[in-house]
Each structure stands twice: as C-alpha cells, then as structure tokens.
C-alpha cells in the first residue's frame, strides 16, 4: 500500500549522515519504473534539505541531526511518478516526530528571586515561589520535569532547616519556627532546580527571603529612673527626656513610643510627647507648679508602641521623681481689682481705702506699695500699709479723668526678694455724686423781635446725676423781670424766655437765676439782642434807607 | 534531659471548660514552636492547635477552632490549651509536642480529658 | 478520615521483615522530604523513630529504615523483634495551616 507510519527520529542523532530512515515504495512499481520524490517543509521548503529520498529507490534520507525544540514534528508529501512524469500515485502523508533528549538543563526564569515573610510565623506559612523553565519535552519523557530543592541556606541560624521548597511547584515555605527578625533580618537560599524530575541536569539561582518586623519587642526604658528639678509656676517647661530602646524594626510603629502617665499627676499637670526622631518621651509641664503647695511630684510612665503587640509583652514603667524649685513670686493683690465707692470732692488726706497684696512665698517678706498709674493725680498711697488718701479734688464731673462715673488706678506692690517681684493692682474708685454743679442754660446768646416777638426756649442742663438735676426752677434777677419773663415747662427741663416790654434795638443782658431739685443755684446772663421787628429773626436787619 | 510534663486533664461536663498545661524543661522553650495533639480512645493521632515560639501566630484545626485558645507564658517555660464549650468528642489524651522542622519532637506523656454528663 | 492513608494493620513473625505505607498526595508526601514515624506502645505517648523519610534519631535501632517514592512513603522494620508490637504512625509537613498532616496509624502485630 501506498502509506507509511508516523517515523520516530531522535533529536541529536550522530549519523552517519545521510542516514536511511524508512522506504516509500508504491505497488505499481511491478508494472512501470516508478520514480519518488517528496516536498514540504524540510524537503523543497524552508528548512530545506533536511530529508531528501532516493530517487529510484524511495528511501527516505536524514541528511543531518534534528534539534526537537526547533522543530518537533515535520509534515512531508511523497510523491510517485512513472518515468514519463505521470503521476501514479496521490501525494503521501509523511509524519517525520522529533524525540526528545535530555539535551537542555532547567533554567530559572531570575538569577535572584525575593520574597518575604513575618518574623514569627509558624510551619506552613508560604514564602514566595521561584520558577525554572526546561525547553525538555514534560510530557512525553521526564527530561524537561523539573524538581526543586533548596541546596543551602545562609545564614544557617537558628538552624539550617528554616525553609522548605514544594519539589514541583516551586513555592517556597517556612518549616521551622523561630524566624527572628532581630536576630537575622535576611536569609539567602541557594535553590536547585533539576530535570528528568530530580535526577538530571541541576540549575542553581538564589532565594533571598527578607524577614519582617512584628511587633514582639517592647520599647523599654533605659534608664527607669529619673530625678528632674522644675521651677515653680513654668508653663510648657521641659522636665525630662525619657529614653527607651526597642529592638523592632527603626520608625515603624512597632518602633515608635508611645507615653503614658500611669501615676502621680492628680492635677493634670504633666503631659508626655514623642520626639519625632530620637523616639525619646518629652515630659513638659501642662501647668505651672507650686512650691509652697506641692514641692516633690513622683510620676509613673508607662511606654508602648505605636502599633499594637503581637503577643502579650510586660510593659515597662519609668519613675520620674520631679522636684519644684521655689521662686520669688510676685506679691498678688487682693482682690486683683478692688472696687470701691468714695463721694466725690471728698476733703484731701481723706482716707479712701486700704488695697493690699498677699506674697504665695512661705518666708515673711515685707511688701511696699506706691502708685503706678492716677492719670489726675488725686491719690497717695502709704508704701507699708497700702493705705489710699486723696490728695486732690476728686471730681465726677471730669470727664477727661472719669468714665462711667469710674476712676481707674493702676498700684504696685514689690517684695524685698532677690531679685525684688512686682505685682499689680486696680482699683476702682466708684464717684459717688455730690450735687456741687447748678443749672445752665443753653444758648446763652439770643436774638429777638421788639414786636410781636418770638419765645426764647432755652434747654438747661447739669452735670450732676439725678436726684440732683431737674426738676428746675427759673427766676430772673436784677430788674430783668421788668422787661422779661422765665417760666420752666412741665417736664422741668427747659426754661421759655419771652420779651414783655418793648425794647429799642440793642443788647441787654438779662439775669436768669436757675436751681436744681437739690436747690443747687447758678446765676447766668443771657446776652440778649433786640431788634426792630416782628415775629422771628435770626439776625438784626440793616438801617433802611429809602431811595 | 528535655522533658514535657501535660496536667490539667480530668473530668468535666459537656459545655464546661478546662485548661491543660505543659511545663517545659531542658531546652530553650522560648526557640520553638509547641503544638498539642489529642488522640481519642482507640483511635488515631490528631493535631489539634500551634503556636509559634514567641506566641505571636497560631493555629488551629477546624474542629476545635472557636472554642480553644492555646498560648504560652515563655517566662514560666508553659504552654497552655484553654477548652471551652467543650463536647463529648473531644474526649482524649492530650499531648503536648515541640515542633522540630517536619516533625513533632519531643512529646509529653499526655493527660486525659474525659466529656460527660 | 486520615489525610494520609496507611494500611490499619500488618504483621510478620519474629526475625522477619515488614513494611508499612502512607500515601499522600504531590502537595504533601510527593512535594517535601519531610517524612516522619512514630512508634506508640499501648498506655505511652508517641515516640519518633524516623524523620525526614529516613533520618533516624539517636537511640533508634537501625533495624527501622525509610523510602519515598512518589506520593508514598514507606517504613521498614527488619528482624521483627517482640519489642516492635506497638501503632506506627506517619506525618508529612504539608503547606498551610495544618501543616503536619497524620495517618491513620497502623497496627504491627508481631506473630
């Protein structure tokens, strides 16, 4: 028949060369001479020249080695001819596969391969997974099977055996405990992989497995005691620094400190920061200390990481023993404004008041007062005993000096320390009213109508307060009421000037006596202008001339 | 001489709870991962928990998951099996186990636990 | 159920040779060489007697050997003595959180 199996052909074959594979022969050769050829790829294509076939006889040729990862199958024709180039029989199927040898070793896919993994861990956590490729076939034959092995291990701490590697898969794993980041940071594996599934041809690459950091190390203070001196009274006053080592992995937060006072600061007055760099807890002061109250504060921080533990760690505590130092403080006034009420224009030496400072320091130091600040110089004060007089008219009135009936004086108080402190006082002098200003009307300057004229209405006003202002009464005085007359309206604050009498044009004075509720009297002279006219007017018309 | 000795076993009712111990002596306890394994009577060998050397990972198996707690004080060179919730299966000599690579070795001698009403 | 297979029982008389199998998987016995045995007399705790395959501890007679083909491990016990009557037990490391996988046990029953 005109057919022929699928021919085997190992790949590397030695030869000789050209070496006879199998024979094409057609049965139509008992009645003709029969001349065979073959095309395809590997005979008349690219690659050609790989096989060829004799002519006359049909035998198929190998005219060199054959190289499987190449080419791995050769698909040809064969085809029979009589001598006069008749075909005599339909092209062939010719299926030339290429078999394998083991003639490639495994190659891994990376010189150096990385992973990772949480110091810790226990067997069976997986690491990474290194890959190795064989051009082999792994299919047919085991020679491109590859098999993994870890050769070596470096460091080998704590024992040689801390890795495993999956013979097929390539994944890498733990199989022993004790990965300890601070003790080996990093492992280096050296790794086989090799063909023909573990007995062939080895490859080596490298493995290098970093170890993670957990949080399983406690910061710890070094050292846990401490004696600190703070003066009395410093606000955000650095105290101590407090130092810890940790032996997890530098500013990561199972590095990174946190403080907590545990213990001894009842009144809030400490509060405990991390420095950002050196990890040190920066103990400062919330609020000032106070020596004569408190003068020793013992502290208990306690320091944790940023991120939680991974298993249960003692915690450790440090003692901060802090002293307060005593300082000169300033004497304080009593109460720091005083308020007081003192009547007006009161006699000079008069008493007004005693304003005095208390000094926070135990010793019995000796306080002398004197004014800071009497912007009208009304007032003395006794430097031992801090005894106000007034030295000067105080006047309610004065309303460059007082404001809202209130006098405001700054005093001193100084301690004999060394150095001498100030403190400050205010006080407050409340006037009280006394009824020591009258009356006055407002305009004092008129101008009137002889006929038919207009009523003056004048408003009055007084500097005291009520009871000693309206209601106000009016009289005229002098022979004023000759010509004029005053009447007060009903509400008491303004006084009606009207002209009763003609007057030639001219200038006279009238003589307006006004007291208040409290009968306080003030004499005024209202410049009084009469012109010659009727009704209203503003300003005295001109002669007239006629024309 | 490396030595685990388990105690804590005894009997209890179903839902109740017990804690077994095992104090280690003769090598670095501290280093190694611990296991417990519990084999009921006339049957097999069966892991039950690990934990790793520092005690920050363990593990457990799906039948007792929940309801045991194993941990480890490494100043006192012990390890410990919390069982709560505890059932008639889980009836066992319990057996404490270092873990060496692939292997568990040493073990202790086992205490008994006994779940019934 | 075990997630290694071993027969329940064998047995052989005195002097002779016996071997016990466990059969795992390619992700277990097939994948690492970390094959243990243990040896368990009636009333006594576990006792390790062969790892990784075939790794013997120091005190352990060399009448016990170990192999590994495939996804099956084997353990040998030649010149059965009276002393061997006990349950074997294998182990194979495994990936995962259950990484130490037992067999069932098998029963050596010295005739």
């Known amino acids: 028949d005109w057919v022929v199996a699928p021919i085997s052909v190992p790949e590397n074959g030695k030869g000789p060369f050209p070496q006879r594979l199998n024979q094409l022969k057609s049965n139509k050769d008992r009645d003709t001479k029969i001349f065979y050829s073959i095309t395809g790829p590997g005979a008349d294509s690219p690659p050609e020249g790989v096989f060829a076939v004799e002519k006359e006889t049909g035998w198929l040729l190998l005219n060199k080695p054959l190289d499987r990862e190449e080419i791995a199958k050769y698909e040809l024709f064969g085809h029979a001819v009589s001598e006069n180039g008749a075909s005599v029989e339909d092209p062939m199927n010719i299926s030339i596969i290429v078999t394998d040898q083991n003639d490639h070793k495994p190659k891994f896919t990376q010189d150096t391969f990385r992973g990772s993994v949480l110091e810790g861990v226990l067997p069976g956590t997986s690491v990474m997974q290194v890959t190795a490729t064989d051009e082999d076939d792994a299919i047919y034959t085991y020679n491109g099977v590859v098999a993994y092995s870890i050769h070596s291990q470096e460091p080998k701490d704590p024992h040689d055996l801390m890795f495993t590697i999956h013979r097929s898969t390539g994944t890498i794993s733990v199989i022993s405990s004790g990965l300890d980041r601070e003790k080996v940071p990093e492992y280096t594996l050296t790794i086989q992989a090799t063909d023909m599934d573990g007995d062939g041809s080895t490859t080596t690459a490298v493995a290098v497995v970093e170890i993670l950091d957990a949080n399983d190390n406690a910061p710890m203070f070094d050292p846990q005691k401490y004696e600190a001196h703070v003066p009395e009274n410093a606000v955000g006053h650095e105290v101590q620094r407090l130092t810890v080592t940790d032996l997890d992995a530098p500013n990561s937060p199972a590095w990174r400190a946190t403080y907590l006072i545990m213990g001894g600061d009842d009144g809030d007055h400490f509060t405990i920061t991390t420095h950002p760099e050196s990890n040190q807890g920066i103990l400062t002061t919330r609020k000032g200390l106070d020596f004569e109250a408190k003068n020793q504060h013992t502290l208990y921080v306690e320091v944790t990481n940023e991120a939680p533990f991974v298993l249960k760690l003692p915690t450790s505590t440090a003692t901060i023993v802090v002293h307060v130092e005593d300082v000169n403080e300033a004497p304080v006034f009593v109460p720091p404004s005083k308020v007081v009420e003192v009547q007006e224009g009161i006699p000079t030496g008069e008493p007004v008041c005693v304003y005095t400072a208390e000094d926070p320091d135990k010793e019995n130091q000796k306080i002398s007062y004197r004014i800071l600040r009497d912007p009208a110089g009304w007032l003395a004060m006794d430097p031992d005993s801090g005894q106000v007089t007034a030295v000067g008219t105080l006047d309610r009135e004065d309303e460059q000096f007082v404001r809202n009936n209130i006098y405001e004086v700054m005093v001193l108080a100084m301690d004999n320390g060394s150095p001498p402190t100030t403190g400050t006082g205010t006080l407050l002098l409340t006037l009280i009213d006394v009824n020591d200003h009258g009356p006055v009307p407002e305009p004092r300057q008129i101008t009137i109508c002889n006929q038919s004229p207009v009523r003056q209405v004048l408003n009055i006003t007084d500097k005291d307060l009520s009871p000693h202002t309206s209601p106000f009464q009016a009289q005229l005085t002098d022979d004023s009421d000759i010509y004029w007359t005053a009447e007060v309206n009903e509400e008491g604050d303004t006084v009606v000037l009207s002209l009763k009498k003609f007057l030639k044009q001219d200038t006279y004075d009238v003589h307006l006596s006004l007291s208040d509720h409290g009968n306080k009297e003030q004499l005024t002279v209202i410049r009084a202008t009469v012109c010659d006219c009727h009704g209203h007017v503003e300003t005295c018309p001109g002669p007239w001339k006629g024309g | 001489e490396v030595q685990l000795l388990e105690s804590g076993g005894g009997l209890v009712q179903p839902g109740g709870s017990l804690r077994l111990s095992c104090a280690a002596s003769?090598?670095?306890?501290?280093?190694?991962?611990m296991s417990w394994v519990r084999q009921a009577p006339g049957k097999g060998l069966e892991w039950v928990s690990a934990?790793?050397?520092?005690?920050?990972?363990?593990y457990y198996a799906d039948s007792v998951k929940g309801r045991f707690t194993i941990s480890r004080d490494n100043s006192k060179n012990t390890l410990y099996l919390q069982m709560n919730s505890l059932r008639a299966e889980d009836t066992a000599v319990y057996y404490c186990?270092?873990?060496?690579?692939?292997?568990?070795?040493?073990w202790g001698q086992g205490t008994m636990v006994t779940v019934s009403s | 159920q075990s997630a290694l297979t071993q027969p329940a029982s064998v047995s052989g008389p005195p002097g002779q040779s016996i071997t016990i199998s466990c059969t795992g998987t390619?992700?277990?016995?097939?994948?690492?060489?970390?094959v243990s045995w243990y040896q368990q007399h009636p009333g006594k705790a576990p006792k390790l007697i062969l790892s990784?395959?075939?790794k013997r501890p120091s005190g352990v007679s060399n009448r016990f050997s170990g192999s590994k083909s495939g996804n099956t491990a084997s353990l040998s016990i030649s010149g059965l003595q009276a002393e061997d009557e006990a349950d074997y037990y294998c182990?194979?490391?495994?990936?995962?959180?259950?990484?130490?996988?037992f067999g069932g046990g098998t029963k050596l029953t010295v005739l």
């Open positions: 186990a270092t873990i060496a690579p692939g292997r568990f070795d040493p």
């Open positions: 003769g090598f670095t306890f501290s280093s190694y991962a």
């Open positions: 934990i790793s050397g520092s005690g920050g990972s363990t």
């Open positions: 390619s992700n277990d016995v097939g994948a690492y060489n970390y």
């Open positions: 990784e395959v075939n």
């Open positions: 182990t194979s490391y495994t990936m995962g959180s259950t990484f130490m996988l």
